[in-house]
Structures are given as C-alpha cells and as structure tokens.
C-alpha cells in the first residue's frame, strides 16, 4: 500500500475546503497549530483545525445527517402520502356514487318520494364521509336517522297518498312507530351491520396511513444529539484537520457511528414491522361486508328491498299506525293497494362490468406489497445511510475517526475512542421523547388494527340472528356479495374503475334504477296504484 500523503504544511487545502462551508477564513489557521482547545478532533500532532471550525463541522455534520435521513425516507414518505390522498379521494368517489345510485333508485322507483328522499339520502352520505374522516358519529344513529326520516314520507306519499294536510303533523309519531313496529323489518339492522363494519375498517385504514405519514415525518425531522454530532464530525471531518481531504471513512466505522446516532430511531423498527403486518392483515380482510366499496355501492338495493318490505306489509301497518298515530276523525282513504307491477318487469339499467379495471381492493394490495418492501426500513437505516454517504469499500485504507488505517478494526477503533466518549452510553440513553411518543402511537394503531373484528382466514363470520337473516353472509360468490341487484346489475367486483372519475361518475339520471315509465310487457300487479276506495284510519 502507498504511504499516507503528508499533512498539508500550509493548511491551504483545508482553508479552501472550509471556505465552502463558511465564507471567510478568519477561523482557519494558516499553518498547523497544536490544537489544544479542540474537543472532538483530538490531535495526535499539529492540526489545521480550530475550535470554531470544529463547531461549524458539528453543525454541518448534523445537517448532513438530517438530509441523508430525509432522502432515505423520501420514497417511503411519498408512497404513503400519495396513497393516503388517493384512498381518501377514492372513498369520497365511492360515497358520491353510492349517493347517486340511491337517489336514482328513488327517482326511478318512487318518484313521489324524491324531493325529501334526496335530502335524507344526502344527509346520510354526508355523515358517512365525515365518519370515514374520523368524525365522532355513531353509525347506528346514522342508519336509524335515515329510516326514521324516510318512513313518514313513505307513509304519507306511498301508503296514504290521499291523506289530508291536517293529518300531516304526525311525523314525530311515525318516526317513533318506525322503530316500535319494526316497520322496515330487519333491513335497518342488516345495513347497520354492513355499514358499521365496512366504515370502521375504512376509517382505521385511513388512520393507519396518516399515522404512517406522521411516523416518517417524525423520524424525518429528528434533531440529532450533540454526542451524535461529535461522532459524525469525527467520522466525516476530523480527517480534514490532518489535511487528509480525499480519505473516506471506513464502512464498518460508519455503521458503528450510525447505529449509535440512530439507536433511538431503530427502536421504532419492531413497531413499524408490526404496523405493516397488521395493516396487511386488515387489507386482506377488506372484502364483502368489510369492503366499503362493496357495501356502499350495494346500499341502494338493500334500501329498495326495505321499502318493498314496508309495501308488502302496508295493510297491517296502516291499520296499526292509524290507531297509534290517530287523529280526531277517522275516515277511510284506502282499503287496499293496487299492485303496480304484476307482469311489468321494469326497465333495468346495467352498469358496465369492467373486468380488468384497477379497483380499490387491488390498489390496497399493491400498496401493501410496496410497504412490505420497507418493512426493515428502520433497522436498515444505519446501513442505508452509510451506503449513501462516502465510505471506503472493503474497509481498506480508510479513516477510523482518529487516523488513516489500512484495515478497519472495530475493537481498535473503540479503544481509541474510549477517552473521547462512550458509544455504549450513547446507545443506552434511550429514544428521544418524540420517538417515544411515535412508538406509543404505533402501539395504539397496531392494537386497533389487531382488534378489528375482521374475518380470519377469509372465512365469513355468520351472524345468524333469531330473525332469520345472516348479516355477515351474502352467498357463495365473493365478488357479488352486496348489490348486484335488479336495480342496475352492478357487479361488485371491480365496481369502481379506480379514479377513472369521468368515465364513471354517475348523474342521478343515469344511475341504476327501474323506471316507472317502463314499457309494460304485461300488466303487472301493484297494490299501490290506481287506487279505489282505500282505507286510512287517519283523518
């Protein structure tokens, strides 16, 4: 090996280099000095560094370290930020489509309900959006409010369209009767189950992504300790004091220094790994009633079923409600419904089923795959930073913090450093308060992710209840669990052409629905139209 270059007799190279860091040369000795006041770059002989230069090197070293850390996390940070924004927007699109589908169902099947129904549907979906974004709203209350609001309109417009104005102040009574008489049967309960499960999962998914951003931002902007600044200075700049401008730190030495500097950050690793694996588990479970796209885009059809149920039981209900919400005079307004549709199969609008479009579900899986490539991000940080800063390959002819060596020996380096400060002590200090805080947040989200009531191993939970409906099961075809109805034949698989907004955005006029202006094939029965002498005990 060639001998090390002799020290710069005039400190010229050091001066020109230092001037790039700090304009002006007042701190740089013209010729080597004893350097007895130095605290970091402890000289073995004359040195081209002063105390002020040392301080500047420490500051620069810490700034360099922060920049390296930020560039190390840039790709990961962008991945999570971009996806959090994309998913938030996508969920908003799903909510908007779901609202349009529901409005279209009312417009096409129950035009007499539309003005009020649109309002109630709008309020419901606004609450859905707010809930996803973290608002403190109870999903059961949202669903109850929707049905409480709809029933008086259904009763006065569909079941008793002949009601005089004097009888229209019974809304409060009708709202109460809706729950007491289970007017909509088990449908509200089914919707509560599906909506609460799917929205809960969606909400925690977004929360987890946002916390991911917070974790990266926290570690991205860490301020490194003075001890770390000293170690970095010794590694990157102390060689300059000896005029060794072209010498690179030893790779092994860099790893030791980085592990010391990042001891606190690396403590995040365990919780970060758990975060990604828990998020993966959540995403794997986001299907059927745990998939908001599936649930919300199929809601209109369940609401339609619930109205049909009311209509089928309208005779009994009208009598009971007539007694319950009775007004002074009783007069018969209707004695039967005239079935509107015996033999009319109403016009069906089909939403194109696009097999290969990107869906929310595939996008989620893709995100998880990318995140998994960052699962060792924190444990690998020291190595990553060393590989992205100048280090000597093969640990030969490199700087070990004190001198130029032919081969790096960790033991020798530690012995040489023990009088300067203890690496072990630095490690034992424990994480910064901000790091401890973010670890607590990760623990909390991991707990939430784990305790989500998700189906394990893709087996559906069958909440078979005594009324005889299975709130968790929608048949054998996973892709068509909820929705897929006669109101529009929406295929739930690949329903949302991912962010292809313009191609897919539904107007109320073109959402799935059955038009009442359908051409009658036959003369379908309806108990609701062409009313004759029909009963209502309400005045």
């Amino acid at each position: 090996q060639p001998p090390p270059p002799p020290p710069d007799a005039t400190c010229h190279q050091v001066r020109s280099f230092f001037q790039r860091l700090q304009p002006g040369l007042k701190w740089v000795p013209e010729t080597p000095v004893p350097g007895s006041d130095l605290q970091v770059c402890l000289p073995k002989g004359p040195t081209c560094c002063s105390r002020k230069m040392e301080e500047k090197y420490q500051l620069t070293a810490r700034l360099n370290m922060e920049q390296l850390l930020q560039s190390a996390s840039m790709e990961l940070k962008f991945l999570i930020i971009q996806n959090a924004a994309v998913f938030q927007e996508a969920f908003e699109i799903v909510v908007r489509h779901a609202k349009n589908y529901t409005n279209a169902m009312f417009k096409n099947n129950y035009p007499s309900l539309t003005p009020q129904a649109f309002e109630f549907v709008g309020e419901f979906f606004t609450d859905v959006s707010l809930y996803i974004l973290g608002s403190d709203i109870n999903v059961d209350d949202m669903v109850n409010e929707l049905f409480d609001s709809l029933f008086p309109v259904i009763y006065t417009q569909l079941m008793n369209p002949g009601l005089p104005d004097s009888a229209l102040d019974i809304n409060e009574c009708l709202r109460g009767a809706r729950r007491d008489l289970k007017v909509f049967g088990n449908f509200p309960k089914l919707i509560m189950t599906q909506v609460s499960k799917s929205l809960q999962v969606t909400r925690i998914f977004l929360q987890a992504l946002n916390l991911g951003i917070e974790v990266i931002n926290t570690t991205d902007h860490l301020k490194f300790s003075k001890d770390c600044g000293r170690m970095l200075t010794r590694m990157w700049y102390c060689s300059y004091c000896q005029g060794l401008m072209m010498v690179k730190p030893c790779g092994g030495y860099c790893n030791v220094v980085m592990q010391g500097c990042m001891a606190g950050v690396v403590e995040i690793d365990k919780y970060w790994r758990e975060y990604i694996l828990s998020l993966e588990e959540l995403v794997n479970g986001m299907y059927r009633i745990y998939d908001m796209e599936n649930v919300l885009l199929g809601l209109f059809s369940t609401i339609h079923d619930s109205i049909q149920y009311v209509q089928k039981n309208a005779g009994k209900l009208t009598t009971t409600i007539g007694k319950l919400c009775a007004h002074s005079q009783q007069r018969q307004y209707r004695s039967a419904y005239y079935p509107e549709d015996l033999f009319i199969d109403k016009k069906v609008l089909k939403v194109a089923h696009v097999e290969h479009e990107e869906t929310l579900s595939s996008r989620r899986r893709e995100l998880i795959q990318k995140l998994k490539s960052f699962i060792s991000f924190y444990s690998a940080l020291p190595g990553y930073i060393c590989s992205h800063s100048p280090v000597a390959e093969n640990d030969t002819l490199c700087w070990n913090g004190q001198e130029l060596v032919e081969r790096y020996s960790q033991k020798a380096a530690r012995n040489g450093m023990k009088n300067q400060f203890n690496l072990h002590e630095l490690k034992m200090k424990g994480p910064e308060p901000v790091v401890s805080q973010i670890i607590d947040k990760l623990k909390h989200i991991n707990q939430l992710l784990r305790t989500m009531s998700m189906p394990k191993g893709r087996v559906l939970d069958k909440n078979l209840d005594e009324e005889g409906f299975e709130s968790g099961d929608c048949g054998d075809d996973e892709d068509e669990c909820i929705g897929g109805s006669g109101d529009g034949m929406i295929k739930v698989k690949n329903q949302l052409r991912f962010l292809a907004e313009l191609a897919y955005d539904l107007d109320v006029d073109d959402a799935p629905g059955n038009s009442q202006q359908a051409t009658p094939k036959d003369n379908e029965i309806s108990t609701f139209h062409n009313l004759g002498n029909v009963h209502s005990p309400l005045k």
């Epitope: 509107e340 929705g483 379908e524 309806s526 108990t527």
Partner: antibody, heavy 119, light 107 residues
Framework: QVQLQQSGAELARPGASVKLSCRAS????????ISWMMQRTGQGLEWIGE????????YYNEKFKGKATLTADKSSSTAYMQLSSLTSEDSAVYFC????????????WGQGTLVTVSA | DIQMTQSPASLSASVGETVTITCRTS??????LAWYQQKQGKSPQLLVY???TLPEGVPSRFSGSGSGTQFSLKINSLQPEDFGSYYC?????????FGGGTKLEIK
C-alpha cells in the same frame, strides 16, 4: 316470460336433510322476493317464508323456523330451501313462488317438488 | 296469524251453473284478499287480488267481492276447465295465510 323451474322429487330418510332448488328466468331475479309454500296431500297451502335475493334477508313463518333455511345464489338466479331433521310430517309438495314488489301476491309459481320422507 | 276459513270445503256443480265460494278472516283485512285456482297435480294460479281485481288473462266470469272479514268468489257459467280447488289468501302482511280450500267437482 317469467318461469320458476324446481328440482325433481326427493325421497329421504327420517332425520335426513334435503335441499330443493328453484331456478328463476324471464325477469330480474333480485328485484322480487321468492316465497316457499308447503302443501300436504289433499290439504291447503302454508307459507314457509321468503327471501329477498338482493340482500339475502329472509323471513320465516314461526312454524317453520329451524325446519327450513332459505338461501339464494344471484349468479345462477336460483333460490334454495333446505329442510332439516325430516319427519313423515314433512312429506308434501313444496312450491316456490315469486311475489310482486309491494304485496304478498304470487302470480308466478314453480311446478312443485314432491318430498317423501320414509324409513 | 290471521286465520282463513273457507266454505264449503267441497261442492259439486254442472257446466253452465253459477257457484259462490266464501272466505272469512279472523280479523279485518280490508280488501287485502286474493283467490287462487289449483288443478290436480299443478301449481296454483292467481285469479283475483285486492278482493275484486282480476289480473290480465283471467276470464270475466270470475268475480270477487267483500271487504273487512267476509269475502266471496263467484264463478258465472261454469266451464269444464273451472273444476279444481280454490284457495283464498290474505296479502295484508306477513305471514300471508291461506284458507283450507274448496274443491269444486263436476256433478
């Protein structure tokens, strides 16, 4: 035109289960409820229950809870009824019928499936 | 559940005659009543709904009447194809129930 095609006759042992099918065609399967009726030889009709194929919600006549289980497969437009713990009392013809969207009226019926329970 | 009582349980009549079958309900069902005809070995067919409305395709010799708890089905000028069993059914709400049936035979 609307058609409901039921599966063939079943002979079963007491205690066994049978699953009857009813394949719908000629209309949008999910737009209407499917009800099932029982008719013992020479007797009247009894409503067993109904399923809303769109949401999978089922309603049962109290008398048949635990005896009948209704399901539907939207992809094949088929409704199913499983009868369990069969006894000779369950020997009957079982009909599926399509209702109208707003009443318990049955304008369309399957041809019926005879179930015979015998040791 | 609403009980449906049909009478008579059976009757014999000749082609060309007029017959009336009655149905009584255990509670007021207003006009929520349907009638079905069933021939031997076949499935029932809807004849009347809302007590008196005939679906398209049902001959006008069939007519329904009544409301509340008393209902009747009248067949004018009996035709050979009219023989079979007749059932009333309420469509007032869940569960729908059927009468025991009336068997109409050729005299």
């Amino acid at each position: 035109q609307v058609q409901l095609q039921q599966s063939g006759a079943e002979l079963a042992r007491p205690g066994a289960s049978v699953k009857l099918s009813c394949r719908a065609s000629g209309y949008t399967f999910t737009s209407y409820g499917i009800s099932w009726m029982m008719q013992r030889t020479g007797q009247g009709l009894e409503w067993i229950g109904e399923i809303y194929p769109r949401s999978g919600i089922t309603y049962y006549n109290e008398k048949f809870k635990g005896k009948a289980t209704l399901t539907a497969d939207k992809s094949s437009s088929t409704a199913y009824m499983q009868l369990s713990s069969l006894t000779s009392e369950d020997s009957a013809v079982y009909f599926c019928a399509r209702d109208v969207s707003d009443g318990y009226l049955f304008p369309y019926w399957g041809q019926g499936t005879l179930v015979t329970v015998s040791a | 559940d609403i009980q449906m009582t049909q009478s008579p349980a059976s009757l014999s009549a000749s082609v060309g005659e007029t017959v009336t079958i009655t149905c009584r309900t255990s509670e007021n069902i207003y006009s929520y009543l349907a009638w079905y005809q069933q021939k031997q070995g076949k499935s029932p067919q809807l004849l009347v709904y809302n007590a008196k409305t005939l679906p398209e395709g049902v001959p006008s010799r069939f007519s329904g009447s009544g409301s509340g708890t008393q209902f009747s089905l009248k067949i004018n000028s009996l035709q050979p194809e009219d023989f079979g069993s007749y059932y009333c059914q309420h469509h007032y709400g869940t569960p729908p129930t059927f009468g025991g049936g009336t068997k109409l035979e050729i005299k």
